[in-house]
């Protein structure tokens, strides 16, 4: 038995930040779980982890180079990614594992979310504007 995960197909980070919501076909209330966010088609790079259990507050871990926060809903974990760089544009996959109570459960691989990080294109005003046309 596998948990199903729904993610937005694409998100655009205009201000170098984005909220990626991972929606699960499973209620995480009073469960011990580990939710993670993986970068790349092969999910090779785990960038954020949210660990939760019934007795302590949510714990969030960010890999070096990523600024991550996490928020828990009954059937969702939202990853808030900040200070993203243009070169972090990629596909990101949500993963969930539930350890307790038994049985151990994890998810079917989701379709992922393409996060497109838009660079800030600032147009500098010229110091010495040319002669104005009549």
């Amino acid at each position: 038995n596998k948990i199903l995960v729904k993610q937005s197909p694409m998100l655009v980070a205009y201000d170098n930040a984005v909220n990626l919501s991972c929606k699960y076909s499973y209620n995480l209330f009073s469960r011990e779980f580990r939710a993670s966010l993986h970068k790349g088609l092969d999910s090779a790079v785990e960038v954020c982890v949210v660990y939760g259990n019934y007795s302590q507050q949510l714990q969030v871990y960010s890999k070096t180079g990523f600024n991550c926060d996490g928020k828990l809903g009954n059937e969702s974990v939202t990853f808030y990614l900040q200070n993203l760089y243009v070169n972090q544009t990629d596909i990101y996959f949500c993963k969930i594992e539930v350890m307790y109570p038994p049985p151990y459960l994890d998810n079917e691989k989701s379709n992922g979310t393409i996060i497109h990080v838009k660079g800030k294109h600032l147009c500098p005003s010229p110091l010495f504007p040319g002669p104005s046309k009549p």
């Epitope: 580990r34 982890v49 871990y61 594992e97 350890m99 994890d106």
Partner: nanobody, 124 residues
Framework: EVQLVESGGGEVQPGGSLRLSCAAS????????MGWFRQAPGKGREFVAA????????DYAESVKGRFTISRDNAKNTVYLQMNSLRAEDTAVYYC?????????????????WGQGTLVTVKP
Amino acid sequence: EVQLVESGGGEVQPGGSLRLSCAASGRMFSNYAMGWFRQAPGKGREFVAAINYRRDDADYAESVKGRFTISRDNAKNTVYLQMNSLRAEDTAVYYCGFTYAGWASSRRDDYNYWGQGTLVTVKP
């Protein structure tokens, strides 16, 4: 809940070697990391080395690179620290830590559980 038990500490002469072990038990997820930190008398706990479950990510403190090697046996849920060319400044209590992060974190705050520590003494 995760329990960590360290072993392998002892007294050794400068230039000598020791191998520390840390066995983890409890509920494990598909990825996590374990690391070694050390605390010399009167100093804070400092990062030594870490490795993740997949064994595709390891990290070392600059002061131990080339001398210490971290490895793990996933079947035994055990991580090892092979310490060669030991120096007097390596004398400390060595602690094993466990984190739910899936990478070799050097941040002490990322570690959720700690072992009781094992003393390493390097002296002539």
